[in-house]
Amino acid sequence: ESALITQQDLAPQQRAAPQQKRSSPSEGLCPPGHHISEDGRDCISCKYGQDYSTHWNDLLFCLRCTRCDSGEVELSPCTTTRNTVCQCEEGTFREEDSPEMCRKCRTGCPRGMVKVGDCTPWSDIECVHKESGTKHSGEVPAVEETVTSSPGTPASPCSLSG
């Protein structure tokens, strides 16, 4: 788990409610699933389903759980030690360089190309030239052959935040 979980909001500032468990820091840090108190004397548990921390830390507030966008499915819920895992719905994918939204997979390859890779939650269909075997750039063609892709098969999640 990485320490800096990008684009995560902090949970709103909160005083420890009576139901939140407290324990003492170990060697000055608090364990996963907790944050440190302002005086550094206590570890306060994160709230299940609301916020989390993934590692030993001196965070003053736990990190807010991600909510899956429309067009995404929740692979695993947010716990006190792990953020929500969201994945693009079948037939859509999220590229590393544009992670903000799921995009529709192409339904087929351009003329003169054959499909060698299916639509997955993290990649579009893959097309190569029939002759040379070189990959297609990925731009949606003006004319498509009737080479259709099968729906994306669930595999490893495309956005693991936490």
Partner: antibody, heavy 119, light 106 residues
Framework: EVMLVESGGGLVQPGGSLRLSCAAS????????MSWVRQAPGKGLEWVAT????????YYPDSVKGRFTISRDNAKNTLYLQMSSLRAEDTAVYYC????????????WGQGTLVTVSS | DIVMTQSPSSLSASVGDRVTITCKAS??????VAWYQQKPGKAPKLLIY???TRHTGVPDRFTGSGSGTDFTLTISSLQPEDFATYYC????????FGQGTKVEIK
């Protein structure tokens, strides 16, 4: 008087390794959470690593995770930063820093040691 | 991660001037903000923590204020030794710093 003195910086090639040290004095070293913070030439400050007072727990930002390792020897009052797979963007002055009592932030810093990653 | 936007990036002032530096957090950080002073080739020095608490030995001409996302460091009457670069830092979620404000002699 709290004193933190870094050493071990220098010129290293991309992909290379380097170990920085920070000698602490003037306080009970084993009681304090310690960190490394860096400052690239002409740039702002960036947190690099944190270690618990006893050395059992560490954490890092994504930018260095898996490449840098923070450690400490409380018997020698020394903090370390082992850096590997160094990149040009790791070029910076590296400071060791102490987390203060009941303030959850850095109260004392060393003078820094310059690490230059270049071929 | 939380971005701290500091302004101005530099300013020119004279001894005795009142100087104000601001820092804006990209999200609510409560009062978990510190201010540091750094002179060339020297270690940063803690001035203010918890947004408004002066560190030991810091002159009372340095005042910090703010909460949530907007923070200010004020030097009420600039002294010759105050010409330096000042950084804000949030420590609510890990540690991130502003880009610095260089206070120069006018």
């Amino acid at each position: 008087e709290v004193m933190l003195v870094e050493s071990g910086g220098g010129l290293v090639q991309p992909g290379g390794s380097l170990r920085l040290s920070c000698a602490a004095s003037g306080f009970t070293f084993s009681s304090y959470v310690m960190s490394w913070v860096r400052q690239a030439p002409g740039k702002g400050l960036e947190w690099v690593a944190t270690i618990s007072s006893g050395g059992s727990y560490t954490y890092y930002p994504d930018s260095v995770k898996g490449r840098f390792t923070i450690s400490r020897d409380n018997a020698k009052n020394t903090l370390y930063l082992q850096m590997s797979s160094l990149r040009a963007e790791d070029t910076a002055v590296y400071y060791c820093a102490r987390r203060g009592d009941s303030m959850i932030t850095t109260d004392y810093w060393g003078q820094g040691t310059l690490v230059t990653v270049s071929s | 991660d939380i971005v701290m936007t500091q302004s101005p990036s530099s300013l020119s002032a004279s001894v005795g001037d009142r100087v104000t530096i601001t820092c804006k957090a990209s999200q609510d950080v409560g009062t978990a903000v510190a201010w540091y002073q750094q002179k060339p080739g020297k270690a940063p020095k803690l001035l203010i923590y918890w947004a408004s608490t002066r560190h030991t030995g810091v002159p009372d001409r340095f005042t910090g204020s703010g909460s949530g996302t907007d923070f200010t460091l004020t030097i009420s009457s600039l002294q010759p030794e105050d010409f330096a670069t000042y950084y804000c830092q949030q420590y609510s979620s890990y540690r991130t710093f502003g880009q610095g404000t260089k206070v120069e002699i006018k």
